[in-house]
């Protein structure tokens, strides 16, 4: 039961995380105009990965897409790539994990296959989360660098009298959404990997128990042949005790005192 819960929770957490990564990637508020210590503006600037926007005090908002690809900073391109890779990996991970869920039965899929898929999706979620965190962190670093550079030459004199105020940008809401979403996806991935360990049956070779029947000097090994559902493909049949009808979770538990007559 604990395995199912861990797997289900991991899936849900990752789903929320990936939704957050998608939202962050699409958001326009990756960087917002720094209002601290600035003249009061009737125009509020903010920028995303795909376009930059202005909210006028008149209430109107206007956005302009970055129509150039080559003219964009390499760092911005890198952030875009990281976020997209994160989304793609996360989406594939979600797809794989749906089929891996213990509560969903697809044909005669064995536990070993589900365990494999759970681990695969878990790894994908971890990488997806790391991509998102890396992308957001790279952008944040870029902002910090630019912020202090623009602070250093906040007012660049032009012809003595004219001043050109550089618009300084600070962290936007999308960065926090991205960090949290990346973290959730990462946690979800770890949970999936943990669940995978529980899904894989223990390949325990139980020692033969000798029963000395009266009048007969023969050793008896109980239990019929049963195909192994161990992690990975295993063609060898192992003799394991079939203790009658039990729940799926109980099948994977260690032998108890009732397993031996």
């Amino acid at each position: 039961m604990a395995v199912t819960a861990c797997q289900g929770l991991g899936f849900v957490v990752s789903l929320i995380g990936i939704a957050g990564i998608i939202a962050a990637t699409c958001m326009d508020q990756w960087s917002t105009q720094d209002l601290y210590n600035n003249p009061v503006t009737a125009v509020f600037n903010y920028q995303g990965l795909w376009r930059s926007c202005v909210r006028e005090s008149s209430g109107f908002t206007e956005c302009r897409g970055y129509f150039t690809l080559l003219g964009l900073p390499a760092m911005l391109q890198a952030v875009r790539a990281l976020m997209i890779v994160g989304i793609v990996l996360g989406a594939i991970g979600l797809l794989v994990s749906i089929f891996a869920l213990k509560c969903i039965r697809i044909g005669s899929m064995e536990d070993s296959a589900k365990a494999n898929m759970t681990l695969t999706s878990g790894i994908m979620f971890i990488v997806s989360g790391l991509c998102a965190i890396a992308g957001v962190s790279v952008f944040a670093n870029m902002l910090v660098t630019n912020f202090w550079m623009s602070t250093a030459n906040m007012y660049t004199g032009m012809g003595g009298m004219v001043q050109t105020v550089q618009t300084r940008y600070t962290f936007g809401a999308a960065l926090f959404v991205g960090w949290v979403a990346g973290g959730l996806t990462l946690i979800g991935g770890v949970m999936m990997c943990i669940a995978c360990r529980g899904l894989a049956p223990e390949e325990t070779n139980y020692k033969a128990v000798s029963y000395h029947a009266s009048g007969h000097s023969v050793a008896y090994k109980p239990g019929g042949f049963k195909a192994s559902t161990g992690f990975g493909s295993n063609t060898k049949n192992k003799k394991i005790y079939d203790g009658g009808a039990r729940t799926e979770d109980e099948v994977q538990s260690y032998p108890s005192k009732h397993d031996y007559v």
């Epitope: 003249p39 009737a42 005090s57 209430g59 302009r64 004219v162 105020v165 618009t167």
Partner: antibody
Framework: EVQLVESGGGLVQPGGSLRLSCAGS????????MSWVRQAPGKGLEWVSS???????YYLDSVKGRFTISRDNAKNTLYLQMSSLRAEDTAVYYC???????????WGQGTLVTVSS | DIVMTQSPDSLAVSLGERATINCKSS????????????LTWYQQKPGQPPKKLIY???TRESGVPDRFSGSGSGTDFTLTISSLQAEDLAVYYC?????????FGQGTKLEIK
């Protein structure tokens, strides 16, 4: 047709108070950022105050603390409450709507405020 | 506060001739977000409220004759009337809409030569 009609102007003594009104027809004032602009006799235009979405207000430094911009959505009216009036506040006061580019596109005909003893 | 300086203070031009009014801002009015300049040109005739001609430095208001055009970016802007008509005689103001307090130029009076 959009119309803005100012009222409430008149002669007032220095230190006195006055409330200007701007009634809108063909326009819902609450959905737009609105401004007051004044023009002293024979002089240029001077922005006085603005009210934007969320009721955020902005004022010219020389009127801060003395003037208050507000609006009554039910009456579709913009107000400028003026107190501690000075001789230099004498002007024609216009109300105007802020639109694209923060530009003032619709203006009222103006109301004259004279501060004199 | 942003200082808006218009030149000349008055301008006498013959009918049918080109009229050019300049406006200089003490700070850049160019928004990095949408690459637009927050400058507006108004026309005011005696006894009337101002009328918006040009916004975003170069976008003509609907209904404004195409002989009126705006240009410039950053701190230097120009209003051009390509062929002056009698009804164009008025005072012209530039206004910056980027920073509070919103400020106007002192005005340029356009007269017939």
């Amino acid at each position: 047709e959009v119309q803005l009609v100012e009222s409430g102007g008149g002669l007032v003594q220095p230190g006195g108070s006055l409330r200007l009104s701007c009634a809108g027809s063909g326009i819902t004032l609450s959905t737009y950022a609105m401004s007051w602009v004044r023009q002293a006799p024979g002089k240029g235009l001077e922005w006085v105050s603005s009210i934007i979405s969320g009721g955020i207000t902005y004022y010219l430094d020389s009127v801060k603390g003395r003037f208050t911009i507000s609006r009554d959505n039910a009456k579709n009216t913009l107000y400028l409450q003026m107190s501690s009036l000075r001789a230099e506040d004498t002007a024609v006061y216009y109300c105007a709507r802020k639109y694209h580019g923060n530009a003032l596109d619709y203006w009222g005909q103006g109301t004259l405020v004279t501060v004199s003893s | 506060d942003i200082v808006m300086t218009q030149s000349p203070d008055s301008l006498a031009v013959s009918l049918g001739e080109r009229a050019t009014i300049n406006c200089k801002s003490s700070q850049s009015l160019l928004s990095s977000g949408n690459q637009r300049n927050y400058l507006t040109w108004y026309q005011q005739k005696p006894g009337q409220p101002p009328k918006k001609l040009i916004y975003w430095a170069s976008t003509r208001e609907s209904g404004v004759p195409d002989r009126f055009s705006g240009s410039g970016s950053g701190t230097d802007f120009t209003l051009t009337i390509s062929s002056l008509q009698a009804e164009d005689l008025a005072v012209y103001y530039c206004q910056q809409n980027y920073f509070y307090p919103l400020t106007f130029g002192q005005g340029t009076k356009l007269e017939i030569k």
